[in-house]
């Protein structure tokens, strides 16, 4: 197993509708043609799996059906869309990259993203 | 090393809007979150919002909400908080702080906004 | 929204001695409590995140503790410099929240 860098941004606030989209961007040290990504959610020291998805390089990244995320992939870069988030779900959500083939293994995880969530305000009731 | 540099003083007539900018250096900007908190004399810390240069989404305390505005230019690395209607009790000194994973980590020198007729 | 008391207000304490500082909140905020230092006409400074972390260039004779609702700044054997306000501040949820400050003078 060898090392990769990872980044992503430290900090990002989920839209009003409970969206939060980064990009995790991986160091390839060579031509990887299966590449597997996890987003790993950590809040006050437990670390759970929110999603992962494998792709071929050049291919769309095809999570579960029932999966709170959604992705692309361009060259290094892997643009994660998280949704369905409420205000309990704030934390830091790692991006974890594993070359998976041709060998040899690599294995990146970035520091995290920070993503803060706030829930809509309730409508106010309105008369029709 | 991280640096935010805010713009210098402002006397504003009571109605009147002010705009405060803050230069962020020292770190990649888009990574980051801007926060806004203001000091009234002799007062304590008070949130006011905060903008995230990633995705350009604000959250802003309800109590300023439709009357403050948050934004950000990543192509200069600079956050602009503009505060609109000003009252005699806005008089305070505005700061801009940087919004890491551990909440506000990095602060500027403070914007004095003088509201008087 | 989350809502944070610290207390004393107001603290006289002799070079040397040790003062701690305690901060609490409206609900259960984990570890994301931060603290501050605010000397007269000068920007707040990061001193504590994540209530036990020291920021870098902090002496160490500042330290936190507590999780959950109730925390403590504690500093050992006080300098005159250390003269300052402190305020605790939570991140833990939106909006985020400061403390009302304490004021630390020397005798």
């Known amino acids: 197993c060898k090392a990769m860098h990872v980044a992503q941004p430290a900090v990002v606030l989920a839209s009003s509708r409970g969206i939060a989209s980064f990009v995790c961007e991986y160091a390839s040290p060579g031509k990887a043609t299966e590449v597997r990504v996890t987003v790993l959610r950590q809040a006050d020291s437990q670390v759970t799996e929110v999603c992962a998805a494998t792709y071929m390089m050049g291919n769309e990244l095809t999570f579960l059906d029932d999966s709170i995320c959604t992705g692309t992939s361009s060259g290094n870069q892997v643009n994660l869309t998280i949704q369905g988030l409420r205000a309990m779900d704030t934390g830091l959500y790692i991006c974890k990259v594993e070359l998976m083939y041709p060998p040899p293994y690599y294995l990146g995880i970035g520091n995290g993203t920070q993503i803060y969530v706030i829930d809509p305000e309730p409508c106010p009731d309105s008369d029709f | 090393q991280v640096q935010l540099v805010q713009s210098g003083p402002e006397v504003k007539k009571p109605g009147a809007s002010v705009k405060v900018s803050c230069k962020a250096s020292?770190?990649?900007?888009?990574?980051?979150?801007i926060g806004w908190v203001r000091q009234a004399p002799g007062q304590g810390l008070e949130w006011m919002g905060w903008?995230?240069?990633?995705?350009?989404?604000?959250n802003y305390v309800q109590k300023f909400q439709g009357r403050v505005t948050m934004t950000t230019d990543p192509s200069t690395s600079t956050a602009y908080m503009a505060l609109r209607s000003l009252r005699s009790d806005d008089t305070a000194v505005y700061y801009c702080a940087r919004v890491g994973a551990s909440g506000v980590d990095y602060w500027g020198q403070g914007t004095l906004v003088t509201v008087s007729s | 929204e989350i809502v944070l008391t610290q207390s004393p207000d107001f603290q006289s304490v002799t070079p040397k001695e040790k003062v701690t500082i305690t901060c609490r909140a409206s609900q259960s905020i984990g570890s994301s409590l931060h603290w501050y230092q605010q000397k007269p006409d000068q920007s707040p400074k990061l001193l504590i995140k994540y209530a036990s972390q020291s920021f870098s260039g902090v002496p160490s004779r500042f330290s936190g503790s507590g999780s959950g609702t109730d925390f403590t700044l504690t500093i050992n054997s006080l300098e005159a410099e250390d003269a300052a306000t402190y305020y605790c501040?939570?991140?833990?949820?939106?909006?985020?929240?400061f403390g009302p400050g304490t004021k630390v003078d020397i005798k």
């Open positions: 020292g770190y990649t900007f888009t990574n980051y979150g």
């Open positions: 501040h939570q991140s833990s949820s939106l909006p985020f929240t």
């Open positions: 903008i995230s240069a990633y995705n350009g989404n604000t």
